[in-house]
């Protein structure tokens, strides 16, 4: 059958600097040359788009300049990094992959990666 499966890790812990990285891998049913990757955040049944990028196979992902996401691609694998995360950003981050060209179009949606963000404790004042 022709369907697209998307795999991503179940859980990721953001670094103390508020950076989280995870791999989004898709099993392509066709030979796509143009792929769109979107990161969605689901929290309290609300869904928001975190970032999106379209790339040509073999080229790098290009997110908008003001995006909190960066990424690299290798074959059917996308390495995504989300920056500037705070504790309030903890939630389920879903990888959505669309094979845009050539036809036919295919949609694939991962089960989501639960990203936990813990705000660092403020450094205590010290006298020297």
């Amino acid at each position: 059958c022709k369907a697209m499966h998307v795999a991503q890790p179940a859980v990721v812990l953001a670094s103390s600097r508020g950076i989280a990285s995870f791999v989004c891998e898709y099993a392509s049913p066709g030979k796509a040359t143009e792929v769109r990757v979107t990161v969605l955040r689901q929290a309290d049944s609300q869904v928001t788009e975190v970032c999106a990028a379209t790339y040509m196979m073999g080229n790098e992902l290009t997110f908008l300049d003001d995006s909190i996401c960066t990424g690299t691609s290798s074959g059917n694998q996308v390495n995504l990094t989300i920056q500037g995360l705070r504790a309030m950003d903890t939630g389920l981050y879903i990888c959505k992959v669309e094979l845009m060209y050539p036809p036919p179009y295919y949609l694939g949606i991962g089960n989501g990666t639960q990203i936990y963000v813990i705000d660092p404790e403020p450094c205590p004042d010290s006298d020297f």
Epitope: A3, E34, P103, I109
Partner: antibody, heavy 118, light 108 residues
Framework: QVQLVESGGGVVQPGRSLRISCAAS????????IHWVRQAPGKGLQWVAV????????YYADSVKGRFTISRDNSKNTLYLQMNSLRAEDTAVYYC???????????WGQGTMVTVSS | EIVLTQSPGTLSLSPGDRATLSCRAS???????LAWYQQKPGQAPRLLIY???SRATGIPDRFSGSGSGTDFTLTISRLEPEDFAVYYC?????????SGPGTKVDIK
């Protein structure tokens, strides 16, 4: 609020052309794929065409390929369907619909009626 | 092209009854991308269920979807007067996007 509003329907003779429009509001238009879906009187839903995001990628149903052209103007938050060489079997209510975050068609317009008759 | 078949064509029930609508796909693989819509006369369709089993925003919990592979079900646990309508299943995982012929739920 989030809504889609179609316009431009009417009665047209076979072989002639018509352009219908869909005005979007309440959401970031360029972040969504938008579809045209039609429904002939007393019949089911038939997908017609979709245009994705920046407008470069478009797909059509075989029944309209080569006759219909879907386009969008993201600066005006508007979707279009140019229908040429119209046939009696194109008579239907035409709906525009948004491809939601998870892909399903989550927002629909009220529809515009297109009647092809001599 | 994925062909969707719905059964029965018409379901005659009374308010308070349980309604079970079936949708069968000609090929598997679209299970994550199967939606159900409700349409009342003179109105546009309304999304009820996406991803085979997830309720859309604002949809009452008497509506539930289930199934995988090629067989899918929409269940309305207790029919309310406003639930009498036509219901369509649709796959949106690959183009061309296809819908079933619909099941009409009418009052017995």
């Amino acid at each position: 609020q989030v809504q889609l509003v179609e316009s431009g329907g009417g009665v047209v003779q076979p072989g002639r052309s018509l352009r219908i429009s869909c005005a979007a509001s309440g959401f970031t238009f360029s972040s969504y794929g938008i579809h045209w879906v039609r429904q002939a009187p007393g019949k089911g839903l038939q997908w017609v065409a979709v245009i994705w995001y920046d407008g470069r990628n478009k797909y059509y149903a075989d029944s309209v390929k080569g006759r219909f052209t879907i386009s969008r103007d993201n600066s005006k938050n508007t979707l279009y369907l140019q229908m040429n060489s119209l046939r009696a079997e194109d008579t239907a209510v035409y709906y525009c619909s948004r491809s939601g975050s998870f892909g399903a068609f989550d927002i629909w317009g009220q529809g515009t009626m297109v009647t092809v008759s001599s | 092209e994925i062909v969707l078949t719905q059964s029965p064509g018409t379901l005659s029930l009374s308010p308070g009854d349980r309604a079970t609508l079936s949708c069968r796909a000609s090929q598997s693989g679209s299970s994550s991308y199967l939606a159900w819509y409700q349409q009342k006369p003179g109105q546009a369709p309304r999304l009820l269920i996406y991803g085979a089993s997830s309720r859309a925003t604002g949809i009452p919990d008497r509506f539930s979807g289930s199934g995988s592979g090629t067989d899918f079900t929409l269940t309305i646990s207790r029919l309310e007067p406003e639930d009498f309508a036509v219901y369509y299943c649709q796959q949106y995982g690959t183009s061309p996007f296809t819908s079933g012929p619909g099941t009409k739920v009418d009052i017995k």
